[in-house]
Interface confidence: low
């Protein structure tokens, strides 16, 4: 529908209260640096200014569109030379470009201050002084640290920080009832964050018919009773919606997503019996449940895949006639027979049978050619299984950890010129798969495993892009979006690295590492431990391990001491020696 | 060319029955989801009935429920809509479209076939 003023047509579909809160969400994920109150000043003015247009649309400026009136807004900012630098270049453009370049210029890794949770009691009364405020501060300052976070998903985010503070600073013992909840709401952002992440990587640099392909693998495992022309509908309008939120039109991308939720729950007993609950709930939690919704059962009569895309004599004529609906036939029929696969297995799969098809349907006798097509298919398909398999033993004989420390001297050795907190992160988190995936049975571990080490690998590759100091990276992350892992797996050692100067200042600590949570002093131990394999990469695995088991006694005996600053002193001093004569440095 | 044409419309009694056919050209039947969809005199557009490109989806509009039947023949790339127990309220234009994406109750039909008329009428 065309709408005289798309400004007034979002606000009264949303109402003041999302509108306002998606607008700041949109102007922290772009300006990143900017103070809070400049963000709520410059909302105010945008909202003062759609209410006019709802009163009256044909009032001036209210036929702009969304991104002129937000770019002329964001580009009224005094300091943004000062501040974001040739960002401000940006300002100088006309949309659809100006847009575009402040896209670019996204930050993924912020230099911001780490957030600091105060006391509970600080906190509760911030809350309660200012509610309104308090859930604006955490919506600026999550939207400014993660500049594509789902902005929809926030919006559920934020009425559960707002129903923790609402219960627990009420409570007897406000710290056990809200830091559990804090942590948990942490964490599932930091997830959400890095799968929306994966989402836009795939919109933005493999194009929207990566996005479709991927979107219509899964949604056939999670709804394998719906037809091919159902799922084909909620592909396309899913990829509108994440076009739009990865894009920046976080107004339309909510409208948007409101609206498929409201067709999916419209239509279940054509999608999927599973949805029933979901669709009984509240707008925001329904969007998040049919997200994250279980997968339907399989149809019990589903014929032979060989059928229609082997036996039959037209798969040539269906193919030349229709490409991709036919390869995405191909794919929804395989992916709702297989929930056991990863979605970037099908997709390997529905490209070797493309590639077949490319190469056999040009051929004298294309149905000899192409008879074999899924023998191909049982190489790609054990690859994985043996790695989980391999990995998820070694993850049960060590414990997450040092699974996680085992991942950070294999990825340091293949990639030892990535920046060492880049390694750290994403080597914890693929350590995570462990704990995450292991627990299931065979059927769920590898659309759980390698579908999660996608979206880690691709916090790897948006990190490195920023500052991109490996070949090898750039090769796997660019090269195909589904073989990344697979790409990333098959590195060896570097054997051009040139080993790093040894540098005693990294291996010095200081007492404030005995007051650091438990989690801050693994990530000291292993922020030590890449330095050492990028000191002496060619160290084996009992070098190491005899090193990090000094290193650990070292910082437990010192803890323990009465004078910690002096021992941590003098006996660094020792450890680094005997380090170094132990890795022969 | 892509096209629809229906046939089997007249006048009928209350309470008779009438079968009302719609053969496709162009396109497989099979492979979309196809609908019946009716305008009474001087009144919108009402979608009666629709069925999906598997048949697995079957789905009727309440007036009709347990009255009307749609069904497809695939060998003869045709759509049928079966009216038993017809009412005068049944009186319409009764015209079978095609939809390009949908698969339960339509929003929008890219093919539409002329309309055969159905009168229901002592």
């Known amino acids: 529908d065309a709408h005289k003023s798309e400004v007034a047509h979002r606000f009264k579909d949303l109402g003041e209260e999302n509108f306002k809160a998606l607008v700041l969400i949109a102007f922290a994920q772009y300006l990143q640096q900017c103070p809070f109150e400049d963000h709520v000043k410059l909302v105010n003015e945008v909202t003062e200014f759609a209410k006019t247009c709802v009163a009256d649309e044909s009032a001036e400026n209210c036929d702009k569109s969304l991104h002129t009136l937000f770019g002329d807004k964001l580009c009224t900012v005094a300091t943004l030379r000062e501040t974001y630098g040739e960002m401000a270049d940006c300002c100088a453009k006309q949309e659809p470009e100006r847009n575009e370049c402040f896209l670019q210029h996204k930050d993924d890794n912020p230099n911001l201050p780490r957030l600091v949770r105060p006391e509970v009691d600080v906190m509760c009364t911030a809350f309660h002084d200012n509610e309104e405020t308090f859930l604006k501060k955490y919506l600026y300052e999550i939207a400014r640290r993660h500049p594509y976070f789902y902005a929809p998903e926030l919006l559920f985010f934020a009425k559960r920080y707002k129903a923790a503070f609402t219960e627990c600073c009420q409570a007897a013992d406000k710290a056990a009832c809200l830091l559990p909840k804090l942590d948990e709401l942490r964490d599932e952002g930091k997830a959400s964050s890095a799968k929306q992440r994966l989402k836009c990587a795939s919109l933005q640099k493999f194009g929207e018919r990566a996005f479709k392909a991927w979107a219509v693998a899964r949604l056939s495992q999670r709804f394998p009773k719906a037809e091919f022309a159902e799922v084909s509908k909620l592909v396309t309008d899913l990829t509108k919606v994440h076009t739009e939120c990865c894009h920046g039109d976080l107004l339309e991308c909510a409208d948007d997503r409101a609206d498929l939720a409201k067709y999916i729950c419209e239509n279940q007993d054509s999608i999927s019996s599973k949805l029933k609950e979901c669709c009984e709930k509240p707008l925001l939690e329904k969007s998040h449940c049919i997200a994250e919704v279980e997968n339907d059962e399989m149809p019990a009569d589903l014929p032979s895949l060989a059928a229609d895309f082997v036996e039959s004599k037209d798969v040539c004529k269906n193919y030349a006639e229709a490409k991709d609906v036919f390869l995405g036939m191909f794919l929804y029929e395989y992916a709702r027979r297989h929930p056991d696969y990863s979605v970037v297995l099908l997709l390997r799969l529905a490209k070797t049978y493309e590639t077949t098809l490319e190469k056999c349907c040009a051929a004298a006798d294309p149905h000899e050619c192409y008879a074999k097509v899924f023998d191909e298919f049982k190489p790609l398909v054990e690859e994985p299984q043996n790695l989980i398999k391999q990995n998820c033993e070694l993850f049960e004989q060590l414990g997450e950890y040092k699974f996680q420390n085992a991942l950070l001297v294999r990825y340091t050795k293949k990639v030892p010129q990535v920046s060492t907190p880049t390694l750290v992160e994403v080597s914890r988190n693929l350590g995570k798969v462990g704990s995450k995936c292991c627990k299931h049975p065979e059927a769920k571990r590898m659309p759980c495993a390698e579908d999660y080490l996608s979206v880690v690998l691709n916090q790897l590759c948006v990190l490195h892009e920023k500052t991109p100091v490996s070949d090898r990276v750039t090769k796997c992350c660019t090269e195909s979006l589904v073989n990344r892992r697979p790409c990333f797996s098959a590195l060896e050692v570097d054997e051009t690295y040139v080993p790093k100067e040894f540098n005693a200042e990294t291996f010095t600590f200081h007492a404030d590492i005995c007051t650091l949570s438990e989690k801050e002093r693994q990530i000291k131990k292993q922020t030590a431990l890449v330095e050492l394999v990028k000191h002496k990469p060619k160290a084996t695995k009992e070098q190491l391990k005899a090193v990090m088991d000094d290193f650990a006694a070292f910082v437990e005996k010192c803890c323990k001491a009465d004078d910690k600053e002096t021992c941590f002193a003098e006996e660094g001093k020792k450890l680094v020696a005997a380090s170094q004569a132990a890795l022969g440095l | 060319e892509v096209q629809l044409l229906e046939s089997g419309g007249g006048l009928v009694k209350p309470g008779g029955s009438l079968r009302l056919s719609c053969a496709a050209s162009g396109f497989t039947v099979s492979s979309y989801t196809m609908n019946w969809v009716r305008q009474a005199p001087g009144k919108g557009l009402e979608w009666v009935s629709s069925i999906s490109s598997s048949g697995r989806y079957i789905y009727y509009a309440d007036s009709v429920k347990g009255r009307f039947t749609i069904s497809r023949d695939n060998a003869k790339n045709s759509l049928y809509l079966q009216m038993n127990s017809l009412r005068a309220e049944d009186t319409a234009v009764y015209y079978c479209?095609?939809?390009?994406?949908?698969?339960?109750?339509?929003?929008?039909?890219?093919?539409w076939g002329q309309g055969t008329m159905v009168t229901v009428s002592s």
């Open positions: 479209a095609r939809d390009p994406r949908m698969v339960g109750n339509p929003h929008e039909f890219d093919i």
